[in-house]
C-alpha cells in the first residue's frame, strides 16, 4: 500500500513543529524521520499532539532504538512517558536525576506505579547505588516511591543516607523492605540518645527483631499503638505481658481496641490468661491457668 509507506512531497517533515498536529497517523508514520524526531525530542511535549499521534511517534522511536532509548531522548519524553510500559523502561539506562525529576512530574497522580517503580529501579542501577541525591529526589517528587524498590535494590542504600528518609516515605513499605532498611537505620542512628533515637527509628521498626523490641521496652519509649501494630508478628510473639506493658506505657489501653487484629490477637493467644488479667483491660483468649505449654517445635528439633 503506497499510501502507507510513501510520504507526499508536500508533507515532508524537516523539523518537529506544531504543523504536525494536523498530520493523520499514516502521514506521521510515513513522513517523520525517526532520527530527526530523536534529535528534536525537546520540542515534542510543547506540541499539542493527541495520544493517538504520540503512539505513532513512540513506534518510530521504538524502531530506531530497539535496545532502549538513550537518555537524551528519555529526558524529553514528557507526556510520551505515559505511553511507556515497564518492559520499555526496563531497557533504559538512566543516570541523571534531572531525567528522573522530569518523568516523575509527568506521572504524578497517575496510575503508573509499575512504570515509576521500573524507572526508579533503572536509576538506581544506572547510578550504582541509592545515594543521598537520589533519595532526596524521590522524597521530594514522589513520596512513597522508595517503597516501590525491591529489597535487593534497597540493600544498596548506605546507612548515611537513611537520615534523609521521612516517615511518610515508608508508609507503603512492606515487611521485606523494612527488614532491609531497619539494620541500616539502627546503624545510622546508633549514636543518638534514647528519646531522639526512638523518634528516628520508629518508622523503620517494622523490620526490628524481638531483641531490639525487648530493648526498647526497657527505655520508657511509650510506643504508640500504630507503631506496635506494624511490628513483625515474629518480633511481638515472644514478648511477655510485662514487656509489652513497659513498651506501650500509657498506650497499653489500646490493646483492647486491637484485640482481634494481628499481631495483638496472636500475642494474646501465647500469654497466660492470669498475666493478661494483670493489665485490667479485659483481654480474653490467653492460655487458661493450670495449663501446661508444650513447645513441640523444640521437641521435633531434638529428635
Amino acid at each position: 500500500d503506497v499510501e502507507r509507506t510513501t510520504c507526499p512531497p508536500e508533507k515532508e517533515v524537516h523539523e518537529i513543529d506544531e504543523s504536525l498536529i494536523f498530520y493523520k497517523k499514516r502521514e506521521l508514520e510515513a513522513c517523520v524521520d525517526a532520527a530527526l524526531l530523536a534529535a528534536q525530542m525537546d520540542r515534542v511535549d510543547a506540541i499539542p499532539f493527541t495520544y493517538e499521534q504520540l503512539d505513532v511517534l513512540k513506534h518510530k522511536l521504538d524502531e530506531l532504538y530497539p535496545q532502549g532509548y538513550p537518555e537524551s531522548v528519555i529526558r524529553h519524553l514528557g507526556h510520551l512517558f505515559l505511553k511507556m510500559s515497564p518492559e520499555d523502561i526496563r531497557k533504559w539506562n538512566v543516570t541523571s536525576l534531572e531525567t528522573l525529576k522530569a518523568l516523575l512530574k509527568v506521572s504524578k497522580g497517575h496510575e503508573m506505579s509499575a512504570q515509576v517503580a521500573t524507572l526508579i529501579d533503572r536509576v538506581v542501577v544506572g547510578r550504582g547505588q541509592l545515594d543521598k541525591d537520589t533519595v532526596d529526589t524521590l522524597t521530594a517528587f514522589c513520596p512513597g516511591c522508595l517503597c516501590s524498590l525491591s529489597p535487593e535494590r534497597l540493600s544498596s542504600v548506605p546507612p548515611s543516607v537513611i537520615g534523609a528518609v521521612r516517615p511518610q516515605d515508608l508508609d507503603t513499605c512492606g515487611p521485606r523492605q523494612l527488614d532491609v532498611l531497619y539494620p541500616k537505620a539502627r546503624l545510622a542512628f546508633q549514636n543518638m540518645s534514647g528519646s531522639e533515637y526512638f523518634v528516628k527509628i520508629r518508622p523503620f521498626l517494622g523490620g526490628a527483631p524481638t531483641e531490639d523490641v525487648k530493648a526498647l521496652s526497657q527505655q520508657n519509649v511509650s510506643m504508640d499503638l500504630a507503631t506496635f501494630m506494624k511490628l513483625r508478628r515474629e518480633a511481638v510473639l515472644p514478648l511477655t505481658v510485662a514487656e509489652v506493658q513497659k513498651l506501650l506505657g500509657p498506650h497499653v489501653e489500646g490493646l483492647k481496641v486491637e484485640e482481634q487484629h494481628s499481631p495483638v490477637r496472636d500475642w494474646i493467644l501465647k500469654q497466660r490468661q492470669d498475666d493478661l488479667d494483670t493489665l485490667g483491660l479485659g483481654l480474653q483468649g490467653g492460655i487458661p491457668n493450670g495449663y501446661l505449654i508444650l513447645d513441640l517445635s523444640v521437641r521435633e528439633a531434638l529428635s
Partner: nanobody, 116 residues
Framework: QVQLVESGGGVVQPGGSLRLSCATS????????MGWFRQAPGKQRELVAR???????MYADSVKGRFTISRDNSKNTVYLQMNSLKPEDTAVYYC??????????WGQGTQVTVSS
C-alpha cells in the same frame, strides 16, 4: 468521565455555512485544549482546528480562513463555525481532547454533508 456531545451537523450546499457545537458534561482537564476532528469515509481521522487552554487557535491549511474555533467557558461548550463549505469538507466531525493521564476522548460525532 466527562461526556462530549456534538451537534449542528447537517446537509448544506457548497458555499454554505454550519455551526457545530460541542457540549461537555463538566469541566475538562485537558493537556492540549479542545480540538475539532473529522473523518471522511475510508480515511483516517484528521485534526481540523484546535483551541488551546490559553485561547490560542490553530487551523489545518485546508480550512484556514473558512473555519473558526471558539469556546464559551460559562457554557462548557466549544464551537466550530464553518463558512464557504466545499464538497471535500464532507465527513463526520468529532470534538476531542487529551487528558493528563494518557487518554484521548472523543464525542460520538455529527455528520456534515456538503452537496448540491
Amino acid at each position: 468521565q466527562v461526556q462530549l456531545v456534538e451537534s449542528g451537523g447537517g446537509v448544506v450546499q457548497p458555499g454554505g455555512s454550519l455551526r457545530l457545537s460541542c457540549a461537555t458534561s463538566g469541566t475538562i482537564f485537558s493537556r492540549n485544549g479542545m480540538g475539532w476532528f473529522r473523518q471522511a469515509p475510508g480515511k483516517q481521522r484528521e485534526l481540523v482546528a484546535r483551541i488551546l487552554n490559553d485561547g490560542t487557535t490553530m487551523y489545518a491549511d485546508s480550512v484556514k480562513g473558512r473555519f473558526t474555533i471558539s469556546r464559551d467557558n460559562s457554557k462548557n461548550t466549544v464551537y466550530l463555525q464553518m463558512n464557504s463549505l466545499k464538497p471535500e469538507d464532507t465527513a463526520v466531525y468529532y470534538c476531542g481532547y487529551s487528558d493528563y493521564r494518557g487518554t484521548d476522548y472523543w464525542g460520538q460525532g455529527t455528520q456534515v454533508t456538503v452537496s448540491s
